[in-house]
Interface confidence: medium
C-alpha cells in the first residue's frame, strides 16, 4: 500500500475507525445505564471526548446521543466512566434538563439530561 | 486480534474508514468542480452513495456537502462521476435551486444546487 495510506484499527466488525479509535452509533433508544451496559457487552465504553483534534469527526454528528459523562454531585464535577475528569474547554456543557448524565451533540456540546430518559448512544473503543 | 475484530482500509492518513470505504469531510467551501479536483488530487472522488446499508454512517451527517452526483440535461438523469446512474430509492432528490449538482444531506437526501456555489464537500475512496 502507498506510504500515505494505512490501515485503521482493529475495531469490532462494521464499526467506524478514525485515527485508531473505534466508534459505533446505536439507533435504538436506551437509558444511560442500559446504554453503558450495551457498550460494555461489546468490550467498549460510552463515548469519551478527550481531544478535539483526534476526534474532529464528532463535529459532524447530528442529533443527540448518550456519552460516558456523568455528574458527581458530591464535588460538582463531571467525569468519564473511567473516572477521569472532563478537561476544560473540550465540551460546552448546556443545562437543558435537571440530570446527572450528558448527551453528546455536534460541535462538541454536551446537553445535561436525566439518566433514565431513553436516547440513542455512541460506543467507543480505543485501540492500543 | 479477536475474531470479531478487524482492520479497516487501507485509507489515506486520518480519513474515516467504515466498512472498508474511506471518507473525509472537508471544511473549506469550494464549488463543485474545485471540490472534485480536490478529491481527485487525493486519489479519491466526491462521495458516491451506493448503499444505505454499507453507508449508514451517512444518516448521521449534519449540514450539507457536495457529492459526486451531477444532472445530465440531455436525458434528465442523475449520474455519478464514474458514469453510473443514481439507483432508485437511494436518495431523495429535492429541487430547491436550479442546478446540475447536488449536496448530500443527512438521512440520504440530495439537494440540487448550482454547481458554481461554494460548499463543503465529502471525498470518498473505495478500498479493493
Amino acid at each position: 500500500i502507498p506510504l500515505t495510506e494505512s490501515y485503521c484499527g482493529p475495531c469490532p466488525k462494521n464499526w467506524i475507525c478514525y485515527k485508531n479509535n473505534c466508534y459505533q452509533f446505536f439507533n435504538e433508544s436506551k437509558n444511560w445505564y442500559e446504554s453503558q451496559a450495551s457498550c460494555m457487552s461489546q468490550n467498549a465504553s460510552l463515548l469519551k471526548v478527550y481531544s478535539k483534534e483526534d476526534q474532529d469527526l464528532l463535529k459532524l454528528v447530528k442529533s443527540y446521543h448518550w456519552m460516558g459523562l456523568v455528574h458527581i454531585p458530591t464535588n460538582g464535577s463531571w467525569q468519564w466512566e473511567d473516572g477521569s475528569i472532563l478537561s476544560p474547554n473540550l465540551l460546552t456543557i448546556i443545562e437543558m434538563q435537571k440530570g446527572d448524565c450528558a448527551l453528546y451533540a455536534s460541535s462538541f456540546k454536551g446537553y445535561i439530561e436525566n439518566c433514565s430518559i431513553p436516547n440513542t448512544y455512541i460506543c467507543m473503543q480505543r485501540t492500543v | 486480534i479477536p475474531l470479531t475484530e478487524s482492520y479497516c482500509g487501507p485509507c489515506p492518513k486520518n480519513w474515516i474508514c467504515y466498512k472498508n470505504n474511506c471518507y473525509q469531510f472537508f471544511n473549506e467551501s469550494k464549488n463543485w468542480y474545485e471540490s472534485q479536483a480536490s478529491c481527485m488530487s487525493q486519489n479519491a472522488s466526491l462521495l458516491k452513495v451506493y448503499s444505505k446499508e454499507d453507508q449508514d454512517l451517512l444518516k448521521l451527517v449534519k449540514s450539507y456537502h457536495w457529492m459526486g452526483l451531477v444532472h445530465i440535461p440531455t436525458n434528465g438523469s442523475w449520474q455519478w462521476e464514474d458514469g453510473s446512474i443514481l439507483s432508485p430509492n437511494l436518495l431523495t432528490i429535492i429541487e430547491m435551486q436550479k442546478g446540475d449538482c447536488a449536496l448530500y444531506a443527512s438521512s440520504f437526501k440530495g439537494y440540487i444546487e448550482n454547481c458554481s456555489i461554494p460548499n463543503t464537500y465529502i471525498c470518498m475512496q473505495r478500498t479493493v
Epitope: - | T92, K109, N119
Partner: antibody, heavy 117, light 107 residues
Framework: QVQLQQWGAGLLKPSETLSLTCAVY????????WSWIRQPPGKGLEWIGE???????NYNPSLKSRVTISVDTSKNQFSLKLSSVTAADTAVYYC???????????WGQGTLVTVSS | DIQMTQSPSTLSASVGDRVTITCRAS??????LAWYQQKPGKAPKLLIY???SLESGVPSRFSGSGSGTDFTLTISSLQPDDFATYYC?????????FGQGTKVEIK
C-alpha cells in the same frame, strides 16, 4: 400550490399533553422535512422539531424530552405532542414545510394554545 | 446552539426610506440564512433564502447580503405594506434558530 392546515386543542391545564395535527394539501409529501415552530405571545419564533416521510426526526434539545413528532404518510399528515405542559408553553404553534436546507415555506395558519389552571 | 442576534430591535422609518436590518450569527453559518416578514396575527412569510436569493413573488425592493457571521436585509424603498416584524433564521445546523425580531414601525 402546497397548503398546510392545522388543528388541535387550544386550552390545556398544566401537566396535560398538547396535541396538534397538520395536513398537507397539494404537492409532494416525501422529500421534505415537516416542522413545528412556536411563538409565545409578543415574543420571537422557536423551532420545536421536524420529521420527514420516513419518520426521521430532529428535535430542539431544549424540548426534546417532552416532544414527540409523528407522521401518517397515508393521510399526508404529521402531528406534534408536547407532554407535561406549563404556562411557559402558551404560544401560537405553527406547522411549516422545511424547504430543504434553507427555509420554512409555506406555513400553517397557526393555533393558539393556552395553558392555564 | 447557534445564537442569532438582530439589530435594531425596533426601527422607525417613513415610506420611501431605505431600511437596513442586520443579523449576526454566533458562529459562521456560510450562506445558510433566511429572512421572514410577519404581520400581526399572521404566519411568517419567507422573503429571502440562502442569504441573498429572493423568494418567488417577493418584490425586488427586498434584498439580502452577507456570509459567515454578518448578514443584512435591505428594503430599498419602504412601502406601506412593509411595516411588520422581520426575523432572520439560520439553517446551518439543528436546532434551527431565529433572531429575536426587528419591528419596522411608522415614524
Amino acid at each position: 400550490q402546497v397548503q398546510l392546515q392545522q388543528w388541535g386543542a387550544g386550552l390545556l391545564k398544566p401537566s396535560e399533553t398538547l396535541s396538534l395535527t397538520c395536513a398537507v394539501y397539494g404537492g409532494s409529501f416525501s422529500g421534505y422535512y415537516w416542522s413545528w415552530i412556536r411563538q409565545p405571545p409578543g415574543k420571537g419564533l422557536e423551532w420545536i422539531g421536524e420529521i420527514d416521510h420516513s419518520g426521521s426526526t430532529n428535535y430542539n434539545p431544549s424540548l426534546k424530552s417532552r416532544v414527540t413528532i409523528s407522521v401518517d404518510t397515508s393521510k399526508n399528515q404529521f402531528s406534534l405532542k408536547l407532554s407535561s405542559v406549563t404556562a411557559a408553553d402558551t404560544a401560537v404553534y405553527y406547522c411549516a414545510r422545511a424547504r430543504g436546507p434553507w427555509s420554512f415555506d409555506p406555513w400553517g395558519q397557526g393555533t393558539l394554545v393556552t395553558v392555564s389552571s | 446552539d447557534i445564537q442569532m442576534t438582530q439589530s435594531p430591535s425596533t426601527l422607525s422609518a417613513s415610506v420611501g426610506d431605505r431600511v437596513t436590518i442586520t443579523c449576526r450569527a454566533s458562529q459562521s453559518i456560510s450562506s445558510w440564512l433566511a429572512w421572514y416578514q410577519q404581520k400581526p396575527g399572521k404566519a411568517p412569510k419567507l422573503l429571502i433564502y440562502k442569504a441573498s436569493s429572493l423568494e418567488s413573488g417577493v418584490p425586488s425592493r427586498f434584498s439580502g447580503s452577507g456570509s459567515g457571521t454578518d448578514f443584512t436585509l435591505t428594503i430599498s424603498s419602504l412601502q406601506p405594506d412593509d411595516f411588520a416584524t422581520y426575523y432572520c433564521q439560520q439553517s446551518k445546523e439543528v436546532p434551527w434558530t431565529f433572531g429575536q425580531g426587528t419591528k419596522v414601525e411608522i415614524k
